[in-house]
Every structure is written in C-alpha cells, then in structure tokens.
C-alpha cells in the first residue's frame, strides 16, 4: 500500500480540518512551550505544503516521510535552544533518531501555568468572534499539557467543546448551561490522558507483547461471543493504532483508528451484539463508543479451561509448537469467561501459567509438576478481592476526602522521599477508587477498581522518572507492569527514610485559603497533612486526626473573622505550636 | 527477586528431630514454589521436599518419605520441614530454595533462587 506521496496521502484520507488538528496536536505535544501562534503558522505551512502534494504527488519533497517533514518544520523554530535546551540537539540527527530524541523529550509534567477558565461570557464573546482560533487554542492547550493524549480522541473531545458552547452561548443561563459541560470535559479528559498514558508506557517500556497481551485480555471480555482469530486480528490492528500514536504518528494512527472502526462495524455480528448503536453514529463518536462499549454477555455452557490447558496429554506439545498462540488462547478462554476479573490479574495469571509450563514442560513428568495450577491461582484472585473490599469498606465509612486522607499518609510513609505535590496528586487519584467502583456490583468492582489503579500508579511511575528519589518506586514501576499494583500495596513504611526538618513556613496559611473552592481548600490541606507525615512518619493515625481536625477548625474560624490576616498570623503560631507538642516535634 | 534466609539447623542424637524454617521476602507477591534440598559432603545436591505457593501439594524425596512433613504459610512468607527419627544419613547442609510460577518442581534446575543453607548433624 505505498504511495508516492505519504503527506498527500493522509491528506486525503483525513481531510483538512482532521489533517490540520492533528498536526496541530502532534507539534503540540512535542514542543510544548512554543506560543500558540508558532504552532499556528508551522501548522499552515505544513498545510499548504500538503496541499501541493495533493496537487502533484511528484512535486519536490511529496516523497519525504512525515518524521522528515515535520521534524524539519520543528527544526526551523528560532528558540529552540533558549526554549528547550538540549531537545535542540535532536535537530542536528537524522531521521528515525531525530523523531525518537524528540519522544524521549516529552514532559508529563510541564512547567505551565494552571488553566484558569475565564468568566462565561468572556469565553462566548471569544467562541463567536473567532470560533476556529478558539477550537485550535483547545487542542492546542491540551496537547501540550498532556503529550500523549490520544490524538484522535482529542478530535472527539474538542467537537464536544464546540458543541458545548455553540448550545450554551445561546442559552438564558449561560453559565448554568455551560460549565457543568465544561466540568465534564475536564474530568473526562484527564482520564483519558491518564488511560493513554499507561497504553503508552506499557508500549515503550515493556514493549509490544506486554501490550498485546492486555489487549487480548481487554478485548475477549468485551468480545467473548468472537473466535479467537478475530480477536488475535483486532489485537493486531489496535497495537498499530496505539504504536503509533503513542510514537507521534498522529495522522497515521488517526487514519488507522478509523479503519479498524469501519472493520468492526462492518464485522460486528462476529465481534459483538452490543455494537449496533456505536455502528450508527459518526466516526469520532463511533470510534469513542467502541471503545467504551459495554461487555457482550458470554456464550452459554462454554467448557472448563482445565481440558485444554491443563489435562491435555497435549499441553507441553502445543506450547513448544507455538508459545504465544498457547498462551494468547489461554488468556482469550480466561479473560471471556471472566468479566469479573481485571485485566492485570488476568495477565498475572496468564505470567503464572506461561511460568509453570516452562519449568514442568522440561521436566521428567510434566502433567505431575502441572497438575493443579489452576488450584494456585486462587490466592493470586483473592488477594485484590480482598483489598478492594476492605478498601471499599474504609471509603463507605470515612467518605472520599477522609478515605484520600488515609491513602495519603498510607503512601507518604511508604514513599516519603516523593515529591508533596506528587503524592497529593496521585493519593488523591487513588481515593477516587472509592466513588467510581465502590458502588458496583462484586462482579464488576475488581475490572473497575485494580485497572483504574494502574492507570494512577502509572502516573506516579511517569512523574517519578523524571526526577527518582525513591528507589522503591523505581523497583515496583520497573519489575512488573501488571505487578506495580501488588509491589506497592506490599511496601510497608521506609525504616531507612530520615525525618524532614520541621519548616514553620509550611504550615503557615494567608486570607487567601478563604477564596479558594472546596477542591483547592482540600488540596491545602491534604498538602499539609503530606508535610505532616513527612516530618513525623512515626505519628500515629490518631495524632494525625487530631492535628487535622484542630487545622480545619482553625481555618474555619479564620475565615469567619473579621480581620482573617491577622487571625492567620495569630491563631496560625498557636496552631503550629500545638501540633508540635501533640506530635513531639 | 526472592531471598531467602534458613534456620533451625543443628546437632541432634540419631532418632531425634529437628524442625528447619525458612523465611521469604521480596518480591513474594507472585506464585512461587519452596522447596528444601540437601548436599552431603562430597555428594550432589538432592531434592528432599517440595510445596506449591498454597501449600496443597507436597513432593518428598524417596529417603525421606513418612519422617519428614513439609509446611508453608504463604500469609507469612515461611515455610518449615519438620524432620522426625533422624539418621546418621540426613546429616548434610539443608538449602531453602524457591522457584517463581505455580508447578510441583522436583529438580534442582527448575529453582530460581536459593538460601544459603544451614547445617544438620545426626551424630551420637
């Protein structure tokens, strides 16, 4: 499928405005503190540049590849090097170096100021002027805060912007109407930033099999009516999508996505009964529906696994045959008669199979060695059965900002040398485990909870390898992806870590607290009780309590006074002074 | 990674017993296998016992079948070989090993990772 022109190409496969996004979000997402408006005319160039390929697919440089034409175009930026410092020195290598120099480049965390949203009619005035500046901005602010944002998604994302606004800035209650959308956007968003990101670094630190192998996992729940070849095809077409993507191929990974969307529609009575509306809708909203899709129901009366895969006089002779097909089928037959289960603890049983097999398939008496593994993985099922409902338990009993409490001084002692925003971040992340899975059914809880666990713990694994302190952390994100989850629940509290020194600064609080929206007032808080812990890792659940309870009192009744500043100052030594005698600081 | 760390081993009168434990940490969270082996001196190091993670299958070497019992606790990470009417023969260093996944291993190669062993002397 090769054509004389790659640029032309995706040009026409995608269309301008699909064309002109994503290569928009792709310069965004590698040069992430470049002015809107440089993104804005290299994205033109390119444009135009296309535009005559589409023309003539022979003109001068149609036959370059993308990587050589966007990083050529990146590469003419004048600041790069005051901007960017040693990301310049990418520009001096060629190509696939160069594009691969600008991936180890990305930042997860950009030193970027917070979004702050303007009053409502300030943003409508903006839509209606100039309602093409105003969407690309989006794309534009997104991308760069979240590099690996998938890309295609984006577009999706952003015709829910735009249409947000075109509904609400007509609206009597404007912003009534528009913000909860808006809210709704946000939080979206940063989830599926966050799921990508782990997609991303499964791909690039554990490689292609590690994806595939959660893709079969993910996919035979959903799809458990589908052969395994069709799963094994789908697996395949999603792992391109997702490497490319994940690999700043955004034109290619967007056009890919649709063509594995139009594959399943047109295939959907062999892959899903639950597809048909997805198959109804336009293609950003298609592509996201299939991707949200709810589990078919499984075929009834399918035969025990144990026949196959462990009193088969076969077994060994078909693993040596073709290894990851075995153990692909083994994990297909697994995860579609276990929606139950999550995806990692499919994959750890899918590791504990593949194991066995490989040791007693050497052995004198195979079938002896191999008999009852499936009667070992029973405490690898019950361990996160039993955390999430001991989890869930706490978070029914303390409510969200409590349970988030608890999980931050919980990973504070275990990691105390990780940065306080970072573990105010991620705690805070964890806790929301508590509202978003608490209140389903056993049967769905474990796929919800320990896979959106991953996900968050993959953000503290990304944060962390931009700047390691912990050693800890280094090992539990490393040795194991579907492990991370167990590695951490496992750390108990750092003996070797030694106490920060106690900084009145940090706990002395402004009139400002009294502004701020519940979330922000939290975060201060959580932030405190973080410094809190690492001062005195020692303290008892109790003294913590108490240290908190008597902090909310205090800025309560500081922002009732009537001079709240010197109520601060005042009431704020007293404050300081008690928690240290109560904590013996 | 997995280690290991052997106790309990010592001098006992032929017919006594003598309890060995072994305790595990690190990365113990996954599957894996202990089992005890043994090396006399100027002789190969041999399987005595073995025990899957949840401890419901046992494997014995055929010398010591009826007098030795093989335990683990997987909640705590240990495992003990409880050794009753000795002989002169089971004098030998005992060596806690463990091996990752989910199988009954019997031989010395399907181990990962070992203890550095401890002494037992059956001597009147």
């Known amino acids: 499928d090769a054509h004389k022109s790659e640029v032309a190409h995706r040009f026409k496969d995608l269309g301008e405005e699909n064309f002109k996004a994503l290569v928009l979000i792709a310069f965004a997402q590698y040069l992430q503190q470049c002015p809107f408006e440089d993104h804005v005319k290299l994205v033109n160039e390119v444009t135009e540049f296309a535009k005559t390929c589409v023309a003539d697919e022979s003109a001068e440089n149609c036959d370059k590849s993308l990587h050589t034409l966007f990083g050529d175009k990146l590469c003419t930026v004048a600041t790069l090097r005051e901007t960017y410092g040693e990301m310049a020195d990418c520009c001096a290598k060629q190509e696939p170096e160069r594009n691969e120099c600008f991936l180890q480049h990305k930042d997860d965390n950009p030193n970027l100021p917070r979004l702050v949203r303007p009053e409502v009619d300030v943003m409508c005035t903006a839509f209606h002027d100039n309602e093409e500046t105003f969407l690309k901005k989006y794309l534009y602010e997104i991308a760069r805060r979240h590099p690996y944002f998938y890309a295609p998604e984006l577009l999706f994302f952003a015709k829910r912007y735009k249409a947000a606004f075109t509904e609400c800035c007509q609206a009597a209650d404007k912003a009534a109407c528009l913000l909860p959308k808006l809210d709704e956007l946000r939080d979206e968003g940063k989830a599926s930033s966050a799921k990508q990101r782990l997609k991303c670094a499964s791909l690039q630190k554990f490689g292609e099999r590690a994806f595939k192998a959660w893709a079969v996992a993910r996919l035979s729940q959903r799809f458990p009516k589908a052969e395994f070849a069709e799963v094994s095809k789908l697996v395949t077409d999603l792992t391109k999508v997702h490497t490319e993507c994940c690999h700043g191929d955004l034109l290619e990974c967007a056009d890919d996505r649709a063509d594995l969307a139009k594959y399943i529609c047109e295939n959907q009575d062999s892959i899903s009964s639950k597809l048909k509306e997805c198959c109804e809708k336009p293609l950003l909203e298609k592509s996201h529906c299939i991707a949200e899709v709810e589990n078919d129901e499984m075929p009834a009366d399918l035969p025990s696994l144990a026949a196959d895969f462990v009193e088969s006089k076969d077994v060994c002779k078909n693993y040596a045959e073709a290894k990851d097909v075995f153990l692909g089928m083994f994990l297909y037959e697994y995860a579609r008669r276990h929606p139950d289960y999550s995806v990692v603890l499919l994959l750890r049983l899918a590791k504990t199979y593949e194991t066995t097999l490989e040791k007693c398939c050497a052995a004198a008496d195979p079938h002896e060695c191999y008999a009852k593994v499936f009667d070992e993985f029973k405490p690898l099922v019950e361990e996160p059965q039993n955390l999430i409902k001991q989890n869930c338990e706490l978070f029914e009993q303390l409510g969200e900002y409590k349970f988030q409490n608890a999980l931050l001084v919980r990973y504070t002692k275990k990691v105390p040398q990780v940065s306080t925003p970072t573990l105010v971040e991620v705690s805070r992340n964890l806790g929301k485990v508590g509202s978003k899975c608490c209140k389903h059914p056993e049967a769905k809880r474990m796929p919800c909870a320990e896979d959106y666990l991953s996900v968050v713990l993959n953000q503290l694994c990304v944060l962390h390898e931009k700047t390691p302190v912990s050693d800890r952390v280094t090992k539990c994100c490393t040795e194991s992806l579907v492990n991370r989850r167990p590695c951490f629940s496992a750390l108990e509290v750092d003996e070797t870590y030694v106490p920060k020194e106690f900084n009145a600064e940090t706990f002395t609080f402004h009139a400002d607290i009294c502004t701020l929206s519940e979330k922000e007032r939290q975060i201060k808080k959580q932030t405190a009780l973080v410094e809190l812990v690492k001062h005195k890792p020692k303290a008892t659940k109790e003294q913590l309590k108490a240290v908190m309870d008597d902090f909310a009192a205090f800025v309560e009744k500081c922002c009732k006074a009537d001079d709240k500043e010197t109520c601060f100052a005042e009431e704020g030594k007293k404050l300081v002074a008690a928690s240290q005698a109560a904590l013996g600081l | 990674e997995v280690q290991l760390v052997e106790s309990g081993g010592g001098l006992v009168q032929p017919g006594g017993s003598l309890r060995l434990s072994c305790a595990a940490s690190g990365r113990t969270f996954s599957p894996y296998t202990m089992g005890w082996f043994r090396q006399a001196s100027g002789k190969e190091r041999e399987s005595v016992a073995a025990?899957?993670?949840?401890?419901?299958?046992?494997y014995y070497g055929e010398s010591v079948k009826g007098r030795f019992t093989i335990s683990r606790d997987s909640t705590k990470n240990t495992m003990s070989l409880q050794m009753n009417s000795l002989k002169p023969e089971d004098t030998a260093v005992y060596y806690c090993?463990?091996?990752?996944?989910?199988?009954?291993?019997?031989?010395?190669?399907?181990?990962?990772?070992w203890g550095q062993g401890t002494q037992v002397t059956v001597s009147s």
């Open positions: 090993a463990a091996a990752d996944g989910a199988g009954l291993y019997t031989n010395r190669g399907q181990y990962d990772y």
């Open positions: 025990t899957t993670w949840t401890g419901s299958r046992s």
